[in-house]
């Protein structure tokens, strides 16, 4: 699987999950989240050659098409597969609230 | 929705479904499919700015991150959303078989 266990410990050039730290204020302009100040969101990057963790029959077809037509702009793209939630603290008036923001952290990628 | 109805009738620059015809022999090297000789597979293409048909909370975060960090390589990608099957005819010996190949045609796209 193209997950953090494999990708963070390898020098994989193809589609894989990469490390990305996002600071809520600096990178998003969000001031409403009190904690954490930022988080390891990660992101997906890398080419999607034929047979590389392809998502659907269509992805396989498109990767093969791209192999036969290298100059084509039609190609599968490396995108998130497994996402995890992020717990946050924000304030309603003076009262702190804890909430889970769903689908915030990328754990693995796929070629779609 | 970024579907064929909208995308094929507009000059949309952002993520949208685009027309692509794939010839099984020429483009994939497949000789086993008797009919059709090719099909309109379509593909997804175009940038994914903030708020443009974003798939998950993560996609929104990443698009906003990209807006604040324009040079970053981390950005959402335009990928298939709705896929449809393709009926094909192939031969087993001299006997024709009809089968549906699932997830073969892109009907709409999303930013993931």
């Amino acid at each position: 699987a193209l997950d953090t266990n494999y990708c963070f410990s390898s020098t994989e050039k193809n589609c894989c999950v990469r490390q990305l730290y996002i600071d809520f204020r600096k990178d998003l302009g969000w001031k409403w989240i009190h904690e954490p100040k930022g988080y390891h969101a990660n992101f997906c990057l890398g080419p999607c050659p034929y047979i590389w963790s392809l998502d659907t029959q269509y992805s396989k077809v498109l990767a093969l098409y791209n192999q036969h037509n290298p100059g084509a702009s039609a190609a599968p793209c490396c995108v998130p597969q497994a996402l995890e939630p992020l717990p946050i603290v924000y304030y309603v008036g003076r009262k702190p609230k804890v909430e889970q923001l769903s689908n915030m952290i990328v754990r693995s990628c796929k070629c779609s | 929705a970024l579907d064929t109805n909208y995308c094929f009738s507009s000059t949309e620059k952002n993520c949208c479904v685009r027309q692509l015809y794939i010839d099984f022999r020429k483009d994939l090297g497949w000789k086993w499919i008797h009919e059709p000789k090719g099909y309109h597979a379509n593909f997804c293409l175009g940038p994914c700015p903030y708020i443009w048909s974003l798939d998950t909370q993560y996609s929104k975060v990443l698009a906003l991150y990209n807006q604040h960090n324009p040079g970053a390589s981390a950005a959402p990608c335009c990928v298939p959303q709705a896929l449809e099957p393709l009926p094909i005819v192939y031969y087993v010996g001299r006997k024709p078989k009809v089968e549906q190949l699932s997830n073969m045609i892109v009907r709409s796209c999303k930013c993931s």
């Epitope: 009190h34 904690e35 954490p36 930022g38 603290v89 804890v98 | -």
Partner: antibody, heavy 117, light 102 residues
């Protein structure tokens, strides 16, 4: 590299005020929270507050409410901590420390504040 | 405010020993915890951030584990230079309180 350089030791009388500076270099001063922490002699640590130099936002430990003022000068990349109405229990080493990724990763060298009549 | 309880308050061990220090939060802090090392007269040094991540330049014999309310700092094989006081600190809503030290 990241460097936080603090002002020197200070001696103050009870009820006086003290203002300590922390000059930052080697990173984007305006886009990282700066924390202030103190350590009384032979004691543990006490978090006092934090400031976001980019917009001046602050979070204070309620214990210091009304006595603690955190400011930042973005033109000189300097953070300031002012504590008023000093008492003997405020005698401590005061540290500035950069907030990063759920920790304080770089600390100033500390500034000793002595409160004595 | 969240209370951080560290144990033991002190310990004695020999070079090569495996040492474990624990930190308990009074409520769920998820993985928002850091560990520091302080030697006499010196500035604290970050060892572990986000409960399990080793800070830059810290020897791999140090490791952190846990989430929620219970956390552990482990030194797999003690070295003489590890003699110091160790503190935990939470980062889950201000004030960011510290443990009492080990």
């Amino acid at each position: 590299q990241v460097l936080l350089v603090q002002s020197g030791a200070e001696v103050r009388k009870p009820e006086a005020s003290v203002k300590i500076f922390c000059k930052a270099s080697g990173y984007s001063f305006t886009s990282s929270w700066m924390n202030w922490v103190r350590q009384a002699p032979a004691q543990g640590f006490e978090w006092m507050g934090q400031i976001y130099p980019g917009d001046g936002d602050t979070n204070y430990n309620g214990k210091f409410k009304g006595r603690l003022t955190l400011t930042a000068d973005t033109s000189t990349n300097t953070a300031y901590m002012e504590l008023s109405s000093l008492r003997s229990t405020d005698m401590a080493v005061y540290y500035c420390a950069r907030h990063y990724d759920g920790s304080t990763d770089y600390w100033g060298q500390g500034a000793l504040v002595t409160v004595s009549s | 405010e969240i209370q951080m309880t560290q144990s033991p308050s002190s310990l004695s061990a020999s070079p090569g020993d495996r040492v474990t220090i624990t930190c308990r939060a009074s409520e769920n802090i998820y993985s928002n915890l850091a560990w520091y090392q302080q030697k006499p007269g010196k500035v604290p040094k970050l060892l572990i951030y986000a409960a399990t991540n080793l800070a830059d330049g810290v020897p791999s014999r140090f490791s952190g584990s846990g989430s929620g309310t219970d956390f552990t700092l482990t030194i797999s094989s003690l070295e003489p230079e590890d003699a110091a006081t160790y503190y935990c600190q939470h980062f889950w809503g201000t004030p960011y309180t510290f443990g009492g030290g080990t």
